[in-house]
Interface confidence: medium
């Protein structure tokens, strides 16, 4: 059968039916990420609380993240949500401190329960705070007389920042 002439149009172009199906470059502020396209897609515009992480090109869409004070939520940073402080979570009434027994070591997300060391048969080496999980130590049995040498506990985790956390702090 006859080959579709549009299949020869590379990414960054579209098959222009108004011009005898020749390959025309995508107009400004539009792109086509694959060949053989009959239209170019409109570039995403990073406006408002969104800021441009990657500019749109003729072959790829723009990528957005969030302006200072906000962080990304959703696939492809579809929303920006306010930051809170470590030791807090965002509720409908604003940033609230983590309840006793829970922690949050980031500026986003929810407060999570402290690790229950006893479930692993271990003791609490360092108490938890609103900002940090507890650090579990060796099990009580390991500390009994005559036990073999104890491996020192792993250091407490540094506050994690996901790749979507904003820059410029």
């Amino acid at each position: 059968g006859l080959q579709d002439p549009c299949s020869n149009c590379p990414a960054g172009t579209f098959c222009d039916n108004n011009r005898n199906q020749i390959c025309s470059p995508c107009p400004p502020n539009s792109f086509s990420s694959a060949g053989g396209q009959r239209t170019c897609d409109i570039c995403r515009q990073c406006k408002g609380v969104f800021r441009t992480r990657k500019e749109c090109s003729s072959t790829s869409n723009a990528e957005c993240d969030c302006t200072p004070g906000f962080h990304c939520l959703g696939a492809g940073c579809s929303m920006c949500e306010q930051d809170c402080k470590q030791g807090q979570e965002l509720t409908k009434k604003g940033c609230k401190d983590c309840c006793f027994g829970t922690f949050n070591d980031q500026k986003r997300g929810i407060c999570r329960p402290w690790t229950n060391c006893s479930l692993d048969g271990k003791s609490v080496l360092v108490n938890g705070t609103k900002e940090r999980d507890v650090v579990c130590g060796p099990s009580p049995a390991d500390l009994s007389p005559g036990a073999s040498s104890v491996t020192p506990p792993a250091p407490a985790r540094e506050p994690g920042h996901s790749p979507q956390d904003i820059e410029g702090r």
């Epitope: 990073c46 609380v49 800021r51 809170c84 807090q88 940033c95």
Partner: antibody, heavy 118, light 107 residues
Framework: QVQLQESGPGLVKPSETLSLTCTVS????????VHWIRQPPGKGLEWIGV???????DYNPSLKSRVTISVDTSKNQFSLKLSSVTAADTAVYYC????????????WGQGTLVTVSS | DIQMTQSPSSLSASVGDRVTVTCRAS??????VAWYQQKPGKAPKALIY???YRDSGVPSRFSGSGSGTDFTLTISSVQPEDFATYYC?????????FGGGTKLEIK
Amino acid sequence: QVQLQESGPGLVKPSETLSLTCTVSGFSLISYGVHWIRQPPGKGLEWIGVIWSGGSTDYNPSLKSRVTISVDTSKNQFSLKLSSVTAADTAVYYCARNPLTATVMDYWGQGTLVTVSS
Amino acid sequence: DIQMTQSPSSLSASVGDRVTVTCRASQNVGTNVAWYQQKPGKAPKALIYSASYRDSGVPSRFSGSGSGTDFTLTISSVQPEDFATYYCQQYNSYPLTFGGGTKLEIK
């Protein structure tokens, strides 16, 4: 209609703490942040800091050790405290609203002049 | 900190003139730039955000453009009420910073 009104003493002595209040009306605090900005006489604008509706704050590093911004939602009031002031802190101080949908200071108070002098 | 350098610092124009104010950022700020108008003794007023979007109620003669480090505010036909000082501001990263201002005066 949307209104922001700064208030506080117009004269502060060196080494004391400058305290200003921004009383707002005509909009829901949960949907906005509030910035404080200052402008020395005859000069440009300097950003002091912001408090977002969730209660989190961000400050200009050049002032961070001296600044506290807080909110009393029951009174619809935002406060600015600047400690250990000097003559260089003499300025018109503005509060300005920032919607959570766009990083722009879309409404400003009329400003209040604070002079630091003994 | 990101420096925002405005030029010119002042300019004279007549009613009906087309006027352009430029702002250069010391590093890439994407399109995270706003423009404000300030009249003597008054608070600034938002004109443009995200480099090119007019704030609500701003006349269409005001337009903004640019991305990266170079930005422009254009008044297509200056009106008597437009004589004021104009400031650009970046909000790509903390601390938020303003340009030094451009004073638009009557010729």
